[in-house]
C-alpha cells in the first residue's frame, strides 16, 4: 500500500511538473498587421483565442517573455500570400523573410536566433501566390529574455491562425 501511495505521489509530482512546464503558441492578430515593405517587428499576437495558448510564460509588448530558465524549443511559421483581388504587386521580385530574435534586458543585447525565407519572383500573370517559411530550433533561454518576430513585407502576410504563428516550449532544465 505504501508503494502505491508513493507511486501516486510520484505521478502527481510528475504531472504537476509537466503542467508547470512553460509553453506558448501565439497566432497573428490580423486586425493589427503593421505596414512596411522592409523588415518590421510583429507585435500583435493572440495568446488566448483559437489555437493560441500560453502557460508559465508572459506575452507583453509584442514579445514572448521567458519566466523560467531552461532549454526551449522555439518555432515560427510564417505564410505570405497575394491574390489579384487585392491589387497588384508593385514589384515582382520579393524577399520574403522571417527573423526570430532574442533580446536580453539584463545585458542589453539582441541576437537573431533563427532566420528563414527566400527571394521570390511573383509574376503579375498569376492570380495567386503563396509561400510558407517554417523555422525551429533548440535554445538555452534565461528568465527575463524576450523572443520577438520580424518579417519582411508584412502586407503580404497570411492572417489565418493556421498560417502565421510562433511558439516555444521548455524541454528541460539547465543543469
Amino acid at each position: 500500500e505504501k508503494a502505491m501511495v508513493d507511486g501516486s505521489w510520484l505521478d502527481l509530482a510528475k504531472r504537476s511538473k509537466l503542467e508547470a512546464q512553460p509553453f506558448a503558441h501565439l497566432t497573428i492578430n490580423a486586425t493589427d498587421i503593421p505596414s512596411g515593405s522592409h523588415k518590421v517587428s510583429l507585435s500583435s499576437w493572440y495568446h488566448d483565442r483559437g489555437w493560441a495558448k500560453i502557460s508559465n510564460m508572459t506575452f507583453s509588448n509584442g514579445k514572448l517573455i521567458v519566466n523560467q530558465d531552461g532549454f526551449y524549443y522555439l518555432y515560427a511559421n510564417i505564410c505570405f500570400r497575394h491574390h489579384e483581388t487585392s491589387g497588384d504587386l508593385a514589384t515582382e521580385y520579393l524577399q520574403l523573410m522571417v527573423y526570430v530574435t532574442k533580446t536580453s534586458i539584463k545585458i542589453p543585447s539582441s541576437h537573431t536566433l533563427m532566420k528563414g525565407g527566400s527571394t521570390k519572383y511573383w509574376s503579375g500573370n498569376s492570380e495567386f501566390h503563396f509561400y510558407s517559411i517554417n523555422v525551429g530550433g533548440f535554445f538555452k533561454l534565461r528568465s527575463g529574455e524576450e523572443i520577438s518576430i520580424e518579417v519582411s513585407n508584412p502586407s503580404l502576410l497570411d492572417p489565418d491562425q493556421d498560417a502565421t504563428y510562433f511558439g516555444a516550449f521548455k524541454v528541460r532544465d539547465i543543469d
Partner: antibody, heavy 126, light 103 residues
C-alpha cells in the same frame, strides 16, 4: 495639397502618337504609383496602366499592350503616357490618377485612385 | 476577367431623396470595391473605398455597403451638387456608370 496637373488638349491624325504629361505636387512622388484611365465619349471609365514612380515598374491593360508606354521623371515629379498608332476610337479624355497605396507602407498597388488630374482631351481625326 | 455591372444606368430624384445605386461583380471580390463621382469637365472624385470607408473630405450623406459580389452606394439626402455620374470600380474594372439627375 496634393495636385496632379495634366498637359493640354491634343489633336492627332490616325496612325500618329500622342504623349500626355501629369505633373504631381504636394507629396513625395516616388512613394506612389500613377495610373492612367481614359473615358471615350459615352463610354465607361477604362483603366490603361500604372507606373510605380519609385522603381519605374509598369503594368498595362492587355488592350493597350504594345501601343502604350508609361514613363516617369522623378526629378520633375512627372509621369508620361504615350499612345501610338492612334485610331478614331482613341478619341477620349485621358486622366492620370494617384494610387492611394504608399510604397513605403507596403508593396500592393491597391487601385484606390485618391487624386486625379483634370483630364486631357485627345481627339483623333483625319 | 471580372465584369462590374451597375444599376440603374440613370435615375431622377428630388432634393432630399434617398438615392441607392447598386453594383454587381461577376465573381466575389471580397470588399475591394470603390465608388467615384464624375462631373463634366472636372477631375473624378473618390467617394468610398474598401466598400464602406468614406474618403476624407466627402460628405457623410454618402455611404457604401456590401461584400462579395453585391455592393450599394447610398446618398441619404440628395443635394443639387450631387448631380453627376457615379462609377463603381474593382481594380482594373469599372461599372458602366449611373447618371443622377434632379427631378
Amino acid at each position: 495639397q496634393v495636385q496632379l496637373v495634366q498637359s493640354g488638349a491634343e489633336v492627332r491624325k490616325p496612325g500618329a502618337s500622342v504623349k500626355v504629361s501629369c505633373k504631381a505636387s504636394g507629396y513625395d512622388f516616388s512613394n506612389y504609383a500613377i495610373h492612367w484611365v481614359r473615358q471615350a465619349p459615352g463610354q465607361r471609365l477604362e483603366w490603361m496602366g500604372w507606373i510605380n514612380a519609385g522603381n519605374g515598374n509598369t503594368k498595362f491593360s492587355q488592350k493597350f499592350q504594345g501601343r502604350i508606354t508609361v514613363t516617369r521623371d522623378t526629378a520633375a515629379s512627372t509621369a508620361y503616357m504615350e499612345l501610338r498608332s492612334l485610331r478614331s476610337e482613341d478619341t477620349a479624355v485621358y486622366y492620370c490618377a494617384r494610387d492611394e497605396s504608399n510604397m513605403v507602407r507596403g508593396i500592393i498597388i491597391a487601385y484606390y485612385f485618391d487624386y486625379w488630374g483634370q483630364g486631357t482631351l485627345v481627339t483623333v481625326s483625319s | 476577367e471580372i465584369v462590374m455591372t451597375q444599376s440603374p444606368s440613370s435615375l431622377s430624384a428630388s432634393v432630399g431623396d434617398r438615392v441607392t445605386i447598386t453594383c454587381r461583380a461577376s465573381q466575389s471580390i471580397s470588399r475591394y470595391l470603390n465608388w467615384y463621382q464624375l462631373k463634366p469637365g472636372k477631375a473624378p472624385r473618390l467617394l468610398i473605398y474598401g466598400a464602406s470607408s468614406l474618403q476624407s473630405g466627402v460628405p457623410s450623406r454618402f455611404s457604401g455597403s456590401g461584400s462579395g459580389a453585391e455592393f450599394t452606394l447610398t446618398i441619404s439626402s440628395l443635394q443639387p451638387e450631387d448631380i453627376a455620374t457615379y462609377y463603381c470600380q474593382h481594380t482594373r474594372a469599372f461599372g458602366q456608370g449611373t447618371k443622377v439627375e434632379i427631378k
